[in-house]
């Protein structure tokens, strides 16, 4: 189920790459965030908290990512036209409950000016 399009700027372009921003509520302590391209899982990041508030970050499908207190950024490099597609942030909240899965996304448009290595 697609819950909706992101209500924020999801794609940030720089240096021939793109930062894809996946937000989550900042009260969330344990979650899994997956980046989907179409229906395919490109990246994932799981944050868990153990005893003594020790934080563990795991990735089964690793991408360059950055975690803040209310977002996960996934970075895609060397953009070309094949990157144009629908991208979705698939968030699974574990704690605090209730368990909740949300899917939000948008279409990544690739313009010549955003490509990494334009042929002169």
């Amino acid at each position: 189920e697609i819950n909706g399009s992101a209500n924020y700027e999801m794609f940030i372009f720089h240096n021939g790459g793109v930062q894809i921003l996946c937000k989550y509520p900042d009260i969330v302590q344990q979650f899994k965030m997956q980046l989907l391209k179409g229906g395919q899982i490109l990246c994932d990041l799981t944050k868990t908290k153990g005893s003594g508030n020790t934080v563990s970050i795991k990735s089964l499908k690793f991408c360059h990512s950055q975690l803040s207190n209310n977002s996960v950024s996934f970075f895609l490099y060397n953009l070309d036209h094949s990157h144009a597609n629908y991208y979705f942030c698939n968030l699974s909240i574990f704690d605090p409950p209730p368990f909740k899965v949300t899917l939000t996304g948008g279409y990544l448009h690739i313009y010549e000016s955003q490509l990494c290595c334009q042929l002169k």
């Epitope: 209500n7 900042d26 302590q29 605090p96 409950p97």
Partner: antibody, heavy 121, light 106 residues
Framework: QVQLQQSGPELVRPGESVKISCMGS????????MHWVKQSHAKSLEWIGL????????NYNQKFQGKATMTVDKSSSTAYMELARLTSEDSAIYYC??????????????WGAGTTVTVSS | EIVLTQSPATLSLSPGERATLSCSAS?????MHWYQQKPGQAFRLLIY???KLASGIPARFSGSGSGTDFTLTISSLEPEDFAVYYC?????????FGQGTKLEIK
């Protein structure tokens, strides 16, 4: 139906502590976190904090750190909040509220009816 | 801290009229929620995620807005709608409420 039953009114002396309760029914208690909110004439409504029934993790509004302590008893489906070193500024109605999520954020989907705490000598 | 300012503080209208309640945030928030409070009753969730109608809430209630300006609209007031309404933001810590708008019968 889903209900949050709060304990009755409390009259306490300055400097004392009070522990108020919130019992959940009509749903699986451990499947939701619980928030606490203060309502006073001076400050309207203030978010105090939340406790995860699942992990016992707590998240306090910094303003209430050291003033409020949230705990849960899973066996009785009850959340508790203890208020310490009470002053007249702590006189208020305290509400519990069940945590829920939308697509983008979180909110309280069910509230208790409130517990009135009066601090007076 | 994000300050939520509700206006007007009091709104006097008659049943059947349209009510528009505003909530202005001191800085941008991702979403707004709206609650109703009646004397001696528990708060009731009306709108979550800015515009989504909570379960069991009549369709005459609606929410809109983005950034710093949000609105709760009641299209045609019923006698039971006269109460105090609060906006709430949970996207910027510490999470905050507006001071409330009292909707009273004219």
């Amino acid at each position: 139906q889903v209900q949050l039953q709060q304990s009755g009114p409390e009259l306490v002396r300055p400097g004392e502590s009070v522990k108020i309760s919130c019992m959940g029914s009509g749903y699986t208690f451990t499947d939701y976190a619980m928030h606490w909110v203060k309502q006073s004439h001076a400050k309207s409504l203030e978010w105090i904090g939340l406790i995860s029934i699942y992990s016992d993790h707590t998240n306090y509004n910094q303003k209430f750190q050291g003033k409020a302590t949230m705990t849960v008893d899973k066996s009785s489906s009850t959340a508790y909040m203890e208020l310490a070193r009470l002053t007249s500024e702590d006189s208020a109605i305290y509400y519990c509220g069940r945590n829920n999520y939308g697509n983008y954020g979180w909110y309280f989907d069910v509230w208790g009816a409130g517990t009135t705490v009066t601090v007076s000598s | 801290e994000i300050v939520l300012t509700q206006s007007p503080a009091t709104l006097s209208l008659s049943p059947g009229e349209r009510a528009t309640l505003s909530c202005s945030a001191s800085s941008s928030v991702s979403y707004m929620h709206w609650y109703q409070q009646k004397p001696g009753q528990a708060f009731r969730l009306l709108i979550y995620d800015t515009s989504k109608l909570a379960s069991g809430i009549p369709a005459r209630f609606s929410g809109s807005g983005s950034g710093t300006d949000f609105t709760l609209t009641i299209s045609s007031l019923e006698p039971e709608d006269f109460a105090v309404y609060y906006c709430f933001q949970g996207s910027g810590y510490p999470y905050t409420f507006g001071q409330g708008t009292k909707l009273e019968i004219k």
